[in-house]
């Protein structure tokens, strides 16, 4: 009988394959409390039970039974906050990023039972409670109503809601994707007597129309009114309607800023501050200048009041107001100073307090890194997260400033936590913040904890990932680092993905990942197994990934270094970055890839094009092709208007298809679904027209009906392994 | 206090065209949605129309769209009812009032339109 | 459209007495969109009661409304001679608004 041969622990390990990628083996969990008081939350537990948690008392019991939530095959939930209601969210349906329908059902806590009369209608496009009590605001068909109890009849507050014509209280296709990022345009004031809502006027804007092939004999044809670059805009109106008798005064609409409304202009945020203040972003076309006005309500008037001394201009002159977005205040307890992150002198993004104008502004914080998110102000702290720690930009650390104090004291609340797991947090406080939620989302895996808000003790532990943590251990796992080269006065983060058994000596094959969009961020310190984790432990292949100029929290100096001329550095600093990386000695010259979606199809594409022979070939997904293909708000922020008096020149250098005749080195792969209602199938099929002009070869592929993310399970896995053999192929790796 | 002053009624042919003028006093006239409300020779009231504040958004009673329009002139603090093919069954004391579909908290006086031949 | 019902249409009573209106909704009213009015020979209608119960400036607390649902009831609980007027009821819960036919409070 021979003799069992001992195997050193090392060797059992496994490389990840394709396969436990696309089945999501390896997915990660976290755990957001869903906070309904200072000190208690709700969670879906794993069986879907809605299951309530007392901190202080240490009470838990279910508040909603699965059975409950299967008998609507609910898949959502929403207490009311006199919590005697809950909504029950069943049939949902995307529309676009953020949108999406539903059906609602009603279910009474009290009697156990579902809410009969006045039902729902179906589907509804948006719905919320209000912050106390148990009203109702939804939006259906496009106009706003309001239920002052669930089982009364509603009240319809508008009635202009024409399907993409006018939208009452929910965005319309730009300014959900470019300017809210939310599903929602409406808010509640805090005691639940106004609620303001957004109308969007889409009456002028040209429309996109594609097909959606389906299983029909005819295609659909989908339209979408979508301004590109250089279209008529949405035309925006801000009411705000009282909700108690909201048929006597009706709504109200707040005035828009006069230096604002001089010209083309957009809303961008609302923040109510009390029951009877609001605060209103507002941004010019030209997306250089915001302007914050706050709002008073005048009782006598039955009208709302935008004083000029209460608002307040932020401007940027070296490239655009705010990061991706303009920030948004966070207001203090007395209802009239706030603070906000913007620019300092410097050009970092940091943390200040304005009390009566921007120009006497106090610096909170400073330094050679930015501040990035206000998560709360208390009475007498400040939580906000920033990039300080270490020098790190792709770290985010959860810092509190004593604001009662005289200097305010700060404090890292999570830089020593789990120094090694954790250096990319993010947190959910409790209203007070007398709790809060830390979630934790790398280097390692990732770890959701619960801390007292007065002395960030850790307090339990709500999900730490110990199933993931045991299927790994007989991963062969790649190696991540995560460092910075110079070039000339520049220097770029990179992060590097390294093959389980990489050896310095030998030659691998590279493949870029790029995105590199204004104020994006690739180089961050977080878990991930996904596809490239994949490619370093199985096939082999080295990975980078380069923040170059025009990435974010590395300071406007980097930032607005691609302002009105896109194309060009990001370009450039991942050609300088893969120079770098030959240089380091490992690198097979001859198997260099990039690949890259969205915007990072782009860069791709462009960098495919550069005519530099570093690249043997190149995948982009869904990549824009011209700025004139995309939409306003996105492509005017960088770029400025396509007109012959601003920047049409830049616009027209930039496309893919003006180089066309770069790409007959390369081996090119060409992705796109055909139903991408952000990125239209339109700038595929021209650079693919180009190409074809200019007789140069190249692999392309469409998935019908898919949209910018090629979700539905059957494309994505299609979609990984073409691109997987398009990738062994290029680099001559054997299946 | 909010005043209301109307105008503009008296005897007019059937198919002939009348407008009500509605004159409010206070400064803040543009934010008040209003509304016409109209009363038969002893019978009870009827809502006519109505128009929100600045937003201007207007609506009508099923038995007079197409042929009434509510205006307003915010810089007159002026609010307007005109009357196009008028009918016998329009005979009627036109109030304005102020509010939007309800809780008519300040009323003018009433101006009478008769339709008659 | 919502069709609101007054009953009595005629209530005959003496100063002093109590008065007990009644309004009754085709469907569903909100308590916050009914209100009620008085409205006296050759003059404006005045808003008397809103959200079913609140009492609008200037009016005295004799003055009571109450309901939900479909049932709404006005009271006045010692009548005055100036009580003396035509009472409607109004629903802002649906479009277009619509008033009770009146109910006439007259001396005995």
């Known amino acids: 009988r021979p003799s069992r041969v001992y195997k050193p622990e090392g060797n059992t390990k496994r490389a990840l394959t394709l396969k436990d990628i696309l089945n999501g083996t390896f997915s990660y969990k976290t755990y957001f409390p869903n906070w309904i008081s200072e000190q208690e939350y709700l969670h879906q537990s794993e069986d879907d039970n809605i299951v309530f948690y007392n901190i202080e008392t240490r009470e838990s019991y279910i508040i909603l039974s699965n059975s409950t939530m299967k008998s609507v095959n609910a898949t959502d939930y929403g207490l009311s906050p006199d919590r005697q209601f809950v909504y029950l969210e069943s049939d949902y349906s995307k529309l676009w990023r953020y949108s999406y329908t539903a059906t609602y059902y009603i279910y009474d806590l009290q009697n156990g039972e579902f809410v009969r009369g006045y039902e729902l209608p179906r589907p509804i496009q948006y719905l919320c409670w209000s912050p106390v009590g148990s009203k109702l605001a939804y939006v259906y068909q496009n106009n706003i109503y309001l239920k002052q109890r669930p089982g009364d009849p509603p009240f319809q507050i508008t009635y202009t809601g024409r399907e993409n014509r006018i939208f009452n209280g929910i965005p319309d296709w730009v300014y959900e994707e470019e300017m809210l990022a939310t599903k929602y345009a409406l808010w509640w004031s805090p005691d639940g007597k106004f609620l303001a809502y957004v109308e969007f006027n889409d009456s002028d804007i040209p429309i996109i129309a594609y097909s959606y092939y389906g299983d029909g004999q005819y295609p659909r044809t989908i339209n979408i009114p979508y301004p590109k670059a250089g279209a008529k805009n949405p035309v925006v109106r801000v009411f705000i309607v009282d909700t108690t008798y909201p048929h006597h005064v009706g709504p109200m609409e707040v005035p828009v800023p006069e230096m604002i409304a001089s010209s083309d202009y957009y809303f961008s945020w609302l923040t109510w501050v009390s029951s009877e203040r609001v605060c209103l972003q507002w941004l010019k076309r030209v997306q250089n200048v915001s302007v914050l006005s706050i709002c008073d309500f005048r009782e006598d008037w039955h009208a709302w009041e935008c004083p000029k001394n209460q608002e307040h201009v932020e401007e940027s002159r070296t490239g655009w107001a705010g990061g991706f977005f303009v920030s948004t205040p966070a207001f203090s307890q007395d209802a009239t100073s706030y603070y906000k992150i913007f620019s300092d002198k410097d050009g970092y993004k940091h943390i200040h307090y304005i009390k009566d104008t921007v120009e006497n502004a106090i610096q909170i914080t400073s330094g050679k890194w930015e501040a990035i998110y206000i998560f709360r102000v208390t009475q007498d702290s400040l939580f906000y997260s920033s990039n300080e720690f270490e020098g790190y930009p792709g770290r985010r650390n959860i810092y509190r400033i004593s604001i009662g104090n005289s200097p305010p004291s700060k404090k890292c609340v999570t830089c020593h936590l789990r120094k090694e797991r954790c250096q990319y947090y993010t947190a959910s406080f409790s209203y007070k913040a007398k709790y809060y939620a830390l979630v934790c989302y790398g280097p390692g895996l990732p770890i959701s904890t619960l801390h007292d808000g007065r002395t960030d003790q850790e307090i339990q532990v709500l999900e730490e990932n110990k199933e993931l943590e045991n299927s790994l251990r007989n991963i062969q796992l790649p190696k991540v680092e995560i460092k910075k080269l110079k070039d000339g006065g520049l220097t770029f983060w990179y992060k590097m993905i390294l093959p389980p058994q990489f050896d310095r000596s030998k030659k691998y094959p590279l493949l870029i990942q790029v995105y590199g969009g204004p104020c994006s961020q690739s180089v961050k310190s977080v878990f991930a197994v996904n596809w490239i984790t994949y490619l370093a432990s199985k096939e082999g292949i080295v990975i980078a990934l380069v923040d170059g100029r025009g990435t974010a929290f590395q300071g406007d100096k980097f930032l607005h270094a691609v302002y009105r001329k896109l194309g060009v550095y990001e370009v450039e600093d991942q050609l300088t970055a893969v120079r770098k990386f030959i240089e380091m000695g490992f690198i097979d010259e001859e198997r260099i890839a990039i690949w890259g979606w969205s915007y990072g199809g782009y860069v791709s594409s462009l960098a495919l094009a550069s005519g530099t022979g570093l690249f043997k070939c190149g995948i982009a997904v869904a990549p824009v092709s011209s700025w004139e293909y995309y939409a306003s708000i996105y492509s005017e922020r960088f770029m400025g208007l396509p007109t012959k008096d601003d920047n049409l020149e830049h616009y027209k250098n930039s496309t893919v298809m003006a180089r066309a005749e770069y790409f007959r080195n390369v081996d090119y792969l060409l992705i796109h679904g055909t139903a991408d209602d952000n990125v239209h199938f339109q700038n595929s099929a021209q650079i693919a027209k180009a190409l074809v002009n200019a007789q140069v070869d190249f692999q392309a592929m469409w998935y019908s009906d898919q949209n910018h993310g090629i979700l539905s399970g059957r494309s994505q896995n299609h979609l990984y392994t073409h691109m997987t053999h398009f990738l062994k192929q290029c680099f001559s790796l054997s299946d | 206090e909010v005043q209301l002053l109307e105008s503009g009624g008296g005897l007019v042919q059937p198919g002939g065209s009348l407008r009500l003028s509605c004159a409010a006093s206070?400064?803040?006239?543009?934010?008040?949605?209003m509304s016409w409300v109209r009363q038969a020779p002893g019978k009870g009231l009827e809502w006519v129309s109505a128009?929100?504040?600045?937003?201007?958004?207007?609506y009508y009673a099923d038995s007079v769209k197409g042929r009434f329009t509510i205006s307003r002139d915010n810089s007159k603090n002026t609010l307007y009812l005109q009357m196009n093919s008028l009918r016998a069954e329009d005979t009627a004391v036109y109030y304005c009032?102020?509010?939007?579909?309800?809780?008519?908290?300040?009323w003018g006086q009433g101006t009478l339109v008769t339709v008659s031949s | 459209e919502i069709v609101l019902t007054q009953s009595p249409g005629t209530l005959s009573l003496s100063p002093g007495e109590r008065a007990t209106l009644s309004c009754r909704a085709s469907?569903?009213?909100?308590?916050?969109?009914l209100a009620w009015y008085q409205q006296k020979p050759g003059q404006a209608p005045r808003l008397l009661i809103y959200?079913?119960?609140s009492r609008a400036t200037g009016i005295p607390d004799r003055f009571s409304g109450s309901g939900s649902g479909t049932d709404f009831t006005l009271t006045i609980s010692r009548l005055e001679p100036e009580d003396f007027a035509v009472y409607y009821c109004?629903?802002?819960?649906?479009?277009?608004?619509?008033f009770g036919q009146g109910t006439k409070v007259e001396i005995k």
């Open positions: 009032a102020k509010g939007w579909f309800g809780n008519f908290d300040y």
């Open positions: 206070g400064s803040t006239f543009s934010s008040y949605a």
């Open positions: 128009i929100s504040g600045s937003a201007g958004y207007t």
């Open positions: 469907q569903s009213v909100s308590s916050s969109y």
């Open positions: 959200g079913a119960s």
């Open positions: 109004q629903q802002g819960q649906q479009i277009p608004p619509t």
